[in-house]
């Protein structure tokens, strides 16, 4: 049997049953999430659930730029350091850079300091690039 790989929205890339869209426009975290949702298909700011997934994403983004942090779908909505993925995925894999937790930083970004493989928390109203994800 021929198994067709599902198609992603124009400009998005496919990896392991998911479509990813790297948005090089600048939005705060909540606006970025709304832009992701506008694509339908259950799209949200991206959850990153394994080192393999993180590495694939990091390699893709590094082909475009290496200095701008990127919003992902991890946030701390209760402001109690109880982080959760906006798409409802289980918060098991963690890749914090170890610094910049706490303060008024309740949204997570992929940090450019370690080639986008680690995360930092940041103020949610900062305008940054962002990464969306959905399962086609």
């Amino acid at each position: 049997d021929i198994i067709m790989r599902p198609s992603c929205a124009p400009g998005w890339f496919y990896h392991k049953s998911n479509c990813y869209g790297y948005f090089r426009k600048l939005r705060n975290w909540s606006d970025a999430e709304l832009e992701c949702q506008s694509y339908g298909n259950g799209a949200h700011l991206a959850s990153i659930l394994s080192l393999k997934e993180a590495s694939t994403i990091a390699e893709y983004i590094s082909g475009y730029q290496r200095s701008q942090p990127i919003w992902i779908g991890l946030h701390d909505p209760q402001k109690r350091q109880q982080w959760q993925w906006i798409d409802g995925a289980m918060y098991l894999y963690r890749s914090w850079s170890g610094k910049s937790m706490g303060g008024n930083k309740h949204c997570a970004e992929m940090s450019s300091n370690n080639n986008f493989l680690t995360w930092s928390s940041n103020e949610c109203n900062k305008r940054q690039h962002f990464l969306c994800k959905y399962r086609p």
Epitope: G11, Y22, K25, L26, D31, L34, E35, S38, S67
Partner: antibody, heavy 119, light 112 residues
Framework: EVQLLESGGDLVQPGGSLRLSCAAS????????MSWVRQAPGKGLEWVSA????????YYADSVKGRFTISRDNSKNTLYLQMNSLRAEDTAVYYC????????????WGRGTLVTVSS | QSVLTQPPSVSGAPGQRVTISCTGS?????????VHWYQHHPGTAPRLLIY???NRPSGVPDRFSGSKSGTSASLTITGLQAEDEADYYC????????????FGGGTKLTVL
């Protein structure tokens, strides 16, 4: 084919108000952020304001903040710019432009509408 | 005064090659923000010419090319034609400003 058609430009006195409209067709309007960009006589392009596809987020240049309001009616495929407390320096051709969905470029533009602020 | 600096004017004879520069800083072009270029014939709608530093939208001739290095970007037009006479603008984003996008001051290209 993407089409953007601005209207509403006029001669208005300083301190007056005006509402510009931009009728969009040829694409799914609600999926795109939109901007207003202006060009004063003899000057370059100046970004004025932008609005997200849903209309939930708006952005303004410092020069118009508090005086101009951007809005959209996705059911009518129309973008608006409400201009209050107009000044002589607001005299310009005003263009509406569509922003690419994933990047910051303005990929489609209208031909513009002229706003003249003079007594 | 724009945060992106372009020469006010450039000129060239038909068939020649011209380059328009767009100089920024570490808070815009140098911060890995994309640069886009527009062509504007007065009285018409501006036209996207180059996006994401180097890419041409469909319908734009390959005589137009873009590049970016450090805190500067440039637009190069080869095989200059009479219809290329227009105003050209670079556009990026500046992290030090509260705005959304920022344009260069524009460059008037004259075909001699």
């Amino acid at each position: 084919e993407v089409q953007l058609l601005e209207s509403g430009g006029d001669l208005v006195q300083p301190g007056g108000s005006l509402r510009l409209s931009c009728a969009a067709s040829g694409f799914t309007f609600s999926s795109y952020a939109m901007s207003w960009v202006r060009q004063a006589p003899g000057k370059g392009l100046e970004w004025v304001s932008a609005i997200s596809g849903s209309g939930g987020s708006t952005y303004y240049a410092d020069s118009v903040k508090g005086r101009f309001t951007i809005s959209r009616d996705n059911s009518k495929n129309t973008l608006y710019l409400q201009m209050n407390s107009l000044r002589a320096e607001d005299t310009a051709v005003y263009y509406c432009a569509r922003e690419d969905r994933m990047r910051t470029q303005l990929d489609s533009w209208g031909r513009g509408t002229l706003v003249t602020v003079s007594s | 005064q724009s945060v992106l600096t372009q020469p006010p004017s450039v000129s060239g004879a038909p068939g020649q090659r011209v380059t328009i520069s767009c100089t920024g800083s570490s808070s815009n072009i140098g911060a890995d923000y994309d640069v886009h270029w527009y062509q504007h014939h007065p009285g018409t709608a501006p036209r996207l010419l180059i996006y994401d530093n180097t890419n041409r939208p469909s319908g734009v001739p390959d005589r137009f090319s873009g590049s970016k290095s450090g805190t500067s970007a440039s637009l190069t037009i080869t095989g200059l034609q009479a219809e290329d006479e227009a105003d050209y603008y670079c556009q990026s984003y500046d992290a030090s400003l509260s705005g959304y996008v920022v344009f260069g001051g524009g460059t008037k290209l004259t075909v001699l």
